[in-house]
């Protein structure tokens, strides 16, 4: 069965956009009229996960590419990378868990928590242009909040 | 607190259409699928459609495509079901309810729903 | 689609009676299930989410287990206002489905 998905933009709690940088990595910075045009569009696919109560497992695609954000261990730590997919074969319901992530919400506020590597979250600098991480701590500097806008089908 | 309010009771005659309506309050309608729900006397329920009015998707059960549209008006809170080419056994309450965008508490609030009644 | 089967269609039951309802589907869906009462003339309302989880304001007599393709309702001590018909949704695929109802009549 096609899993379900829907399209929309990401911006961390500072209102900063996040674009491509590069081909596989993805930076935040602050955008601003036609600039906005740059941001990256998600499809974000409702998936299998394991059943908590506040945490709705996600998976984050960039949409008509077949690109994923995914969280692999990199020189022994927990890293996000965008991998690229067979899109014959994704996105589907039981997606690999290093493609999952457990979207928390509380009032509007979104984070992103991997599910390969629990309480790691997907992370923005207070700094502009930087890329976006996978950040193993929540309410320090790093930024781990969002708010998501829906972005017509 | 959450509301769904649906417009009032019509009589039809077979072929033509009627549009339903389901005006939302207490929460922010963008976030929220409107589902479209039918019951016929004595029977169970039936999943018509859906749409995410902050996105504009819809998604309709194949059994009505084509005779069945769904829209929404963000102005004014208030999502419609237009069905045509009404035949008797159309004959049905239509409720609209609500449901989050990632589907997480399932159909939580209904409205109080509208019957239609397709009659010669 | 996504076939299913709510059984009974019909029980008569007593105050302070265990009564439990099933769903069962030709095939898996996640956590995707939802259960509602109907009195007649009213909207259905609900009662439970995601398999087990009890809708804010419901009576914790009311429970929701199972997965896979087997789902359960449980009314541990029946209450005379529970007396009503009970349906089960998923809402795991297109089209969701509803089970054919189950209705609780007073033995």
């Known amino acids: 069965a096609p899993v379900r998905s829907l399209n929309c933009t990401l911006r961390d709690s500072q209102q900063k956009s996040l674009v491509m940088s590069g081909p596989y990595e993805l930076k935040a910075l602050h955008l601003q009229g036609q600039d906005m045009e740059q941001q990256v569009v998600f499809s974000m696919s409702f998936v299998q996960g394991e059943e908590s109560n506040d945490k709705i497992p996600v998976a984050l695609g960039l949409k008509e590419k077949n690109l994923y954000l995914s969280c692999v261990l990199k020189d022994d730590k927990p890293t996000l990378q965008l991998e690229s997919v067979d899109p014959k074969n994704y996105p589907k319901k039981k997606m690999e868990k290093r493609f999952v992530f457990n979207k928390i919400e509380i009032n509007n506020k979104l984070e992103f928590e991997s599910a390969q590597f629990p309480n790691w979250y997907i992370s923005t600098s207070q700094a502009e242009n930087m890329p976006v991480f996978l950040g193993g701590t929540k309410g320090g500097q790093d930024i781990t909040d969002f708010t998501m806008q829906f972005v017509s089908s | 607190q959450v509301q769904l309010v649906q417009s009032g009771a019509e009589v039809k005659k077979p072929g033509s259409s009627v549009k339903v309506s389901c005006k939302a309050s207490g929460y922010t309608f963008d976030r929220y699928w409107i589902e479209w729900v039918r019951q016929a006397p004595g029977q169970g329920l039936e999943w018509m459609g859906e749409i995410l009015p902050g996105s504009g998707t819809i998604n309709y059960n194949e059994k009505f495509k084509g005779r069945v549209t769904i829209t929404a008006d963000k102005s004014t809170s208030t999502a419609y079901m237009e069905l045509s080419s009404l035949r008797s056994e159309d004959t049905a309450v239509y409720y609209c309810?609500?449901?989050?965008?990632?589907?997480?508490?399932?159909?939580?609030?209904w409205g109080q729903g509208t019957l239609v009644t397709v009659s010669s | 689609d996504i076939q299913m089967t709510q059984s009974p269609s019909s029980l008569s039951a007593s105050v302070g009676d265990r009564v439990t309802i099933t769903c069962k589907f030709s095939?898996?869906?996640?956590?995707?299930l939802s259960w509602f009462q109907q009195k007649p003339g009213k909207a259905p309302k609900s009662l439970i989410y995601r398999v087990k989880r009890l809708v804010d304001g419901v009576p914790s007599r009311f429970s929701g287990s199972g997965s896979g393709t087997d789902f359960t309702l449980t009314i541990s001590s029946l209450q005379p206002e529970d007396f009503a018909t009970y349906y089960c949704v998923q809402y795991d695929e297109f089209p969701y489905t509803f089970g054919g109802g189950t209705k609780v009549e007073i033995k």
């Open positions: 309810a609500r449901m989050y965008y990632d589907y997480d508490q399932g159909f939580d609030n």
């Open positions: 095939q898996d869906i996640d956590r995707f």
